[in-house]
């Protein structure tokens, strides 16, 4: 019998290499059974995750999964960092793994490096 616990499908140590000025959607895949939980995004500041208020978010529904989306319109250099989504379910908080956005400012890069280059060249990234 499949569990009816809420599950948040963000892979541990996942990352996205993105460019300042581009639009980007950060997705939190949510599995639930009956009632869709309340989901929020936060951004890690050291060990504290600061809730993101007043940001553009939306839901996308697919067959077996819903996606709670945080919109970046556009991506800013200050968006660099790690994010986590959390679901409020039966008065318990379920937290996802964090996922990291590596933001490259295209003004400081002569050409767009590949995703793998960006992940392995931290001097291109904002901290």
């Amino acid at each position: 019998k499949e569990s009816c616990d809420v599950q948040l499908y963000i892979k541990r140590q996942s990352y996205h290499s993105i460019f300042a000025g581009d639009p980007f959607k950060l997705e939190c895949p949510v599995k639930y059974c009956a009632h869709r939980p309340q989901v929020t995004w936060c951004k890690l500041n050291g060990t504290t995750c600061v809730k993101l208020e007043g940001r553009h978010t939306s839901w996308k529904q697919e067959k077996n999964l819903s996606f709670f989306i945080l919109h970046f319109e556009p991506v800013l250099p200050s968006d660099n960092g790690s994010y986590r989504c959390s679901a409020n379910f039966l008065s318990a908080i379920i937290e996802s793994h964090s996922t990291t956005l590596y933001v490259t400012d295209v003004k400081s890069a002569s050409e767009r490096p590949s995703k793998d280059e960006m992940a392995s060249r931290p001097w291109l990234l904002y901290s």
Partner: antibody, heavy 119, light 112 residues
Framework: EVQLVQSGAEVKKPGESLKISCKTS????????IHWVRQMPGKGLEWIGR????????KYSPSFQGQVTISADKSISTAYLQLSSLKASDTAMYYC????????????WGQGTLVTVSS | DIQMTQSPSSLSASVGDRVTITCRSS???????????LNWLQQKPGKAPKRLIY???KLDSGVPSRFSGSGSGTDFTLTISSLQPEDFATYYC?????????FGQGTKLEIK
Amino acid sequence: EVQLVQSGAEVKKPGESLKISCKTSGFNIKDTYIHWVRQMPGKGLEWIGRNDPANGNTKYSPSFQGQVTISADKSISTAYLQLSSLKASDTAMYYCASYEGYYERFGYWGQGTLVTVSS
Amino acid sequence: DIQMTQSPSSLSASVGDRVTITCRSSQSLLDRDGKSYLNWLQQKPGKAPKRLIYLVSKLDSGVPSRFSGSGSGTDFTLTISSLQPEDFATYYCWQDTHFPYTFGQGTKLEIK
């Protein structure tokens, strides 16, 4: 049934290149990380790197960076390890392993591919 | 890189014995989610490794309950409560908390 089936043993000459495949079945490859691990004759296990088949992101061990390329084609549930400019010291067994990326609920290993580099 | 040091490197034991293998990491394996990503693998001659234990103490499906894992921070233990003939193999610890991921050098468990 869960399976990771690797391509067959290879004998190569120094300087040549090689691409090993790892065909997965019985689970969704997009839910996993695919790892590649080397085992030289009579030695222990060495982590080469890891690929996220969902988006192509790859991490390499510094010991192998620039010597290998890891990739995956999620449409055919297959991962790849490319070895370039082969040397005799690349002679080893190479394993792929698929670990669930969310909660580590499974960790499956391929049967290995023996690569022999000899002139 | 994190060094994973297993002890002993080899071990002779008899069927029915209780066996303990230790693995020490050069820094804490505690991730920021509060979990330690420490696996134990078993490898028999000529075969691929097989995961036995993950997240320090969680047993993989189908792994006999005589295997158990424990520990935290930098010190971890694999225990086989009563050795069976099929348990004679090489055992590796593997950390996947910090990049690059690293293995212990292995502990070869032989029949006395």
